[in-house]
């Protein structure tokens, strides 16, 4: 957890992905209870979910969320307009595409409406919190007698994503994996025609448009080899 207390002089360490600050209180009370941490993820830059663990509250509390963008034209405080709920208690907020500004510092504030002094603010770099959709339309081309090429599509700008390809045969106990850059193409130079291969791919918003750590879900697997169609030996796009 990268955290720091924000100081009035503005000299916070802006290299951290987010910062946490709590309002000071004069006496020990409910106000001193820390608020849960807010976690935000931007899904394919289509919407963003900011969620917190509502069960960490000592009693069921409908915490409220406000947000704004620091030092920008979008610095007006906004109320959450679409809450997410867990057992009828607020546990998150969903923001739509037009409310997402990847390259401005996103400030999110959680507050206990019954104790307005009890609030916590975090600053997030949204370009580091993007999770793309899983790769789609995996296809295999046989380039030569022993060489396969795997291609896939992403529903996002190609150069913003890097990829991880995993493959194995039915004889393997574990996956072999290979990193692939924005060109979203993978070649396997030596294929054993007697074995059945399985391939899958996942993608990450890194490093050209952001520095996200989280990968997408895995694609549907695609298979090639002894048990696949013999109709067209040069093109296979069979999903499990």
């Amino acid at each position: 957890l990268n955290t720091t207390i924000l100081t009035p002089n503005g000299n916070e360490d802006t290299t951290a992905d987010f910062f946490l600050t709590t309002m000071p209180t004069d006496s020990l009370s409910v106000s001193t209870l820390p608020l849960p941490e807010v976690q935000c993820f931007v899904f394919n830059v289509e919407y963003m979910n900011c969620t917190w663990n509502s069960s960490s509250e000592p009693q069921p509390t409908n915490l409220t969320l406000h947000y704004w963008y620091k030092n920008s034209d979008n610095d007006k405080v906004q109320k959450c307009s679409h809450y997410l709920f867990s057992e009828e208690i607020t546990s998150g907020c969903q923001l739509q595409k037009k409310e997402i500004h990847l390259y401005q510092t996103f400030v999110v504030q959680l507050q206990d409406p019954r104790e307005p002094r009890r609030q916590a603010t975090q600053m997030l770099k949204l370009q580091n919190l993007v999770i793309p959709w899983a790769p789609e339309n995996l296809t295999l081309h046989k380039l030569s007698e022993s060489q396969l090429e795997l291609n896939w599509n992403n529903r996002f700008l190609n150069h913003c994503l890097e990829h991880l390809v995993q493959y194995r045969t039915d004889w393997d106990h574990s996956w072999t994996e290979q990193s692939v850059d924005y060109r979203h193409k993978f070649s396997l130079p030596s294929v054993d025609g007697q074995k059945r291969y399985t391939f899958r791919v996942r993608s990450r918003f890194n490093p050209l448009c952001g520095s996200a750590q989280h990968w997408s879900e895995w694609s549907h697997p695609i298979h090639w080899g002894s048990n696949t169609s013999k109709e067209n030996p040069f093109l296979f796009a069979l999903e499990a």
Partner: nanobody
Framework: QVQLQESGGGSVQAGGSLRLSCTAS????????MGWYRQAPGNECELVST???????YYADSVKGRFTISQDNAKNTVYLQMNSLKPEDTAVYYC???????????????????WGQGTQVTVSS
Amino acid sequence: QVQLQESGGGSVQAGGSLRLSCTASGFTFDDSDMGWYRQAPGNECELVSTISSDGSTYYADSVKGRFTISQDNAKNTVYLQMNSLKPEDTAVYYCAAEPRGYYSNYGGRRECNYWGQGTQVTVSS
């Protein structure tokens, strides 16, 4: 499948004009920042002009007053009108797409081969 297809390049005399077009598909065009880069032989990829989703534009100092960037959201197309062309404008021109807000708030150097094949512009004296 994300695709950017440039067209409109060609050979022209110094002082002439060309209009480059770039048609985009496979992503939300009107929610992206678009740009034009160029690369002359032996040179690095150079940012020429950008247009953000809010309509704001940027021009490299070397093309200010001569080049104009525009876009047509209905056609998913971005244009670069190039007037008063000079021999030093000779290069392969590449169309680029970035996440919304990239150019105004983030930046970072780009390689020209991140996008399409480009279109050749040759200006002779």
